[in-house]
Interface confidence: low
């Protein structure tokens, strides 16, 4: 039989917990062995004081009785042949030689029935307190300060940790964060970053990425000062910051044991988020303008925001939703974080300017408004913070209230009548389709365009395929040819101020289909851009190329 306890002496600190293991091997008898713990104090090295036993609840001497009853001293069985003695709060008088004894269950005495280990109790001399985050400066006030940092800016906190233990010990220091109002030392204390006793720096799970990116730093300054810097503060960084120092000692068996831990509150940190500050207003109010007139809108970005620069950047854009359309609408123009302007899809060819006219005021100008520009406009501002390195992270966005813009319609009404000249056409001949357009209203200088479209039957029915462009003449008089079903020559021309003609030469069976004429009215603005002021569609014209009687 052999009783095994840790190699001594063990050094532990007053007020902390200690666990001493004991296990027995090579015994006879039941698998469940009993264990008795004794203490031999230095002042009475021959007197065994009964501490606790697995068998007898009345085993404890008076000096331990109350602590055993309170659960402060207990023996915990790990398995049949192994236990651990646990003392919750060490006292100076707990120093001495601890003996683990196993009452015999063997047929004859053989081997050892006890193991002894010395425990020395050190005074609690670990000190932890808040320190000014700078390299020098006076001690922080006793009550933890309340700090406010802007999102994206730097958060720096300092901690003083020292010990005067006479033995060779190592200090590990970590900075942790708990949500506001959480009690200190909660399981909610989340490690931000720590410096191990071997000076290696480690971050808690959510912060590892930021440590690797250099956005989170921890350094030791001098013998007892530690400084944590969180670059690019985020909303989730708000909370109460603590500094925890742990003192470690190497036991004789080579393992490291934590012998003391102290924690101090450093600061209550509020992160003023950009999303809580960013506000966007627009002016000058509802607009009513005529087509071709300039449209100018102003956007003001406000709030307690850090200036654009090393920590923050801003982009501003305008969105437009046509009247009655849901959602925020489409982008008209924007200025990016570098101040570079760009136009949204569909606005590229327009004379539109987006510029910064004051520190936080931006102007959108459309040189010549069109009826299609009518709708609700919103200004969208986005705030970015610079994370690790120069990488920007969007931190907030805000839209203004909608600003209605009305653009008067030109009041153009078009009508189109189309027909097939001659009524009947034969294969090999030329089909001539005419389109007469009537116009009511509109400004002077109105220009007409007309295009010809065909829908082809499949298996005797008009297909669901959309109509195909055959050809047309634009408002600038330039002809545009599409695809003729039969593949033969096509000509489109203006035969009068309001009359267009389509000719299909050398008709084939593939040219069979239903054709229509689609006129449109166009107005040219001062900036030389065109906009469509009206459109129409003629009735259907059926083209069926008949075969001559002689054809086979």
């Amino acid at each position: 039989r052999e009783v095994l306890v840790p190699e001594g002496p063990l050094y532990r600190v007053a007020g902390t917990a200690v666990s001493i293991s004991c296990n027995v091997t090579g015994y006879e008898g039941p698998a469940q062995q009993n264990f008795e713990w004794f203490l031999y104090r230095p002042e009475a090295p021959d007197t065994a004081l009964g501490i606790v036993s697995t068998k007898d609840t009345q085993f404890s001497y008076a000096v331990f009785k109350s602590r055993v009853v309170a659960g402060e001293v207990q023996v915990q069985r790990l398995q049949g042949d192994a236990v651990v003695l646990k003392i919750a709060r060490l006292q100076a008088q707990d120093a001495g030689i601890y003996e683990c004894h196993t009452p015999s269950t063997d047929t004859r005495y053989l081997g050892s029935y006890s193991g002894k280990v010395e425990l020395r109790v050190l005074p609690d001399v670990l000190q932890v307190s808040a320190a000014p985050p700078g390299p020098r400066g006076r001690q922080a006030p006793t009550s933890p300060p309340r700090m406010t940092v802007h999102e994206g800016q730097e958060l720096a906190l300092g901690c003083l940790a020292r010990t005067s233990t006479q033995k060779h010990t190592h200090l590990a220091v970590s900075f942790g964060r708990s949500v506001p109002e959480a009690p200190v030392g909660r399981s909610t204390l989340q490690e931000v970053v720590g410096i191990r006793s071997d000076l290696a720096v480690e971050a808690g799970a959510p912060y590892a990425e930021r440590l690797a990116a250099g956005e989170l730093r921890l350094g030791k300054e001098g013998t007892d000062r530690y400084r944590m810097v969180v670059g690019g503060a985020q909303a989730g960084d708000a909370g109460t910051y603590h500094c925890t120092a742990a003192e470690w000692i190497q036991d004789p068996d080579g393992s490291w044991a934590q012998i003391a831990e102290k924690r101090a509150v450093l600061a209550h940190v509020d992160v003023q988020t950009l999303s809580s500050q960013l506000a966007v207003t627009v002016g000058p109010g509802e607009r009513r303008i005529g087509p071709g007139e300039p449209l100018e809108l102003l956007c003001n970005v406000s709030g307690a925001l850090p200036p654009a620069g090393r920590h923050a950047a801003y982009s501003v854009g305008w969105e437009m939703a046509p009247a009655g359309a849901p959602g925020p609408g489409r982008l008209v123009a924007q200025l990016d974080t570098e101040g570079v302007g760009s136009l949204g899809p569909g606005y590229e060819g327009r004379h539109i300017a987006m510029e910064k006219v004051a520190s936080r005021t931006y102007r959108l100008r459309l040189e010549a408004a069109r009826p299609g520009d009518a709708g609700t406009y919103r200004c969208l501002a986005k705030a970015y913070v610079r994370g690790s390195g120069t990488r920007l992270r969007e931190a907030a966005s805000a839209r203004s209230r909608p600003l209605p813009v009305h653009v008067r319609e030109e009041g153009v009404v078009l009508e189109a009548v189309a027909w097939l000249a001659g009524g009947t056409v034969y294969r090999g001949e030329t089909a001539s389709l005419l389109c007469n357009i009537s116009v009511r209203g509109g400004p002077p200088g109105l220009r007409l365009a007309a295009s010809w479209w065909v829908e082809r039957p499949e298996d005797g029915e008009l297909s669901s395929v959309p109509a195909q462009l055959v050809g047309g003449v634009g408002q600038d008089g330039v002809a545009e040819l599409g695809v003729r079903p039969g593949g033969g020559p096509v000509s489109v021309e203006l035969v009068g101020p309001r009359s267009h003609r389509l000719r299909l030469h050398s008709l084939g069976p593939e040219d069979e289909g239903v054709y229509h004429c689609a006129p449109s009215a166009w107005v040219q603005h001062a900036d030389y851009s065109w906009y469509q002021a009206g459109s129409a569609r003629s009735g259907p014209v059926t083209v069926y190329p008949y075969m001559h009687a002689l054809d086979t």
């Epitope: 708990s178 399981s187 909610t188 989340q190 989730g236």
Partner: antibody, heavy 123, light 103 residues
Framework: AVTLDESGGGLQTPGGGLSLVCKAS????????MQWVRQAPGKGLEWVAG????????AYAPAVKGRATISRDNGQSTVRLQLNNLRAEDTGTYYC????????????????WGHGTEVIVSS | ALTQPSSVSANPGETVKITCSGD???YGWYQQKSPGSAPVTLI????KRPSDIPSRFSGSKSGSTGTLTITGVQADDEAVYFC??????????FGAGTTLTVL
């Protein structure tokens, strides 16, 4: 106001799988641990699963371990519970719950509940 | 496991204490008026009370036992009260519930 809206319940077949989604609003879920709790008809509350604020730590009740997966999308403010190989005893009302802190994995720290979504496992 | 009494009863105006014993440091108390209705948090983290819960409800912890105290019981307090905590494997657990009857 803090609101938690569960969806995805309904009639399920034994052996099949279900996906419950909890949509949170009125607070930023990225700072809090979230949990799923269920209640079988006529029975008490049973803790199902918990996930900490950044999704790095998850815990499951023995009754669903190996069959359940809890996940979260902080950007979408959603928490999802995937439960496979359904059994009749999985029948009940499933509640989404928010804890007051992050990373406690503790049913003693719930400060808000959803209205629940009913799950019936039957052939 | 969490142990709580299956039922308690009281007259209006009396004080009721419901206990919950387990082995964790943090307990919460939840009220459920009817099965299938969403529970309401009365107490979390031993003694924290949400702002919308009346001060008649309070929580405390001594040793490994959590206690919910309802002072000046009202008829509307009739419900099932569950305690919640955490087990040694860091999984959440609830007590079986205590039915409060107001006489």
């Amino acid at each position: 106001a803090v609101t938690l809206d569960e969806s995805g319940g309904g009639l399920q077949t034994p052996g099949g799988g279900l996906s419950l989604v909890c949509k949170a609003s009125g607070f930023s879920i990225s700072s809090y641990e979230m949990q799923w709790v269920r209640q079988a008809p006529g029975k008490g509350l049973e803790w199902v699963a918990g996930i900490d604020d950044d999704g790095s730590s998850r815990a499951y009740a023995p009754a669903v371990k190996g069959r359940a997966t809890i996940s979260r999308d902080n950007g979408q403010s959603t928490v999802r519970l995937q439960l496979n190989n359904l059994r009749a005893e999985d029948t009940g009302t499933y509640y989404c719950a928010k804890t007051i802190y992050a990373a406690t994995l503790n049913a003693g720290e719930i400060d808000a509940w959803g209205h629940g979504t009913e799950v019936i496992v039957s052939s | 496991a969490l142990t709580q009494p299956s039922s308690v009863s009281a007259n209006p105006g009396e004080t009721v204490k419901i206990t919950c014993s387990g082995d964790d440091r943090w307990y919460g108390w939840y009220q459920q008026k009817s099965p299938g209705s969403a529970p309401v948090t009365l107490i979390y983290s031993n003694d924290k009370r949400p702002s919308d819960i009346p001060s008649r409800f309070s929580g405390s912890k001594s040793g490994s036992t959590g206690t919910l105290t309802i002072t000046g019981v009202q008829a509307d307090d009739e419900a099932v009260y569950f305690c919640g905590s955490r087990d040694s494997s860091y999984a959440g657990i609830f007590g079986a519930g205590t039915t409060l009857t107001v006489l």
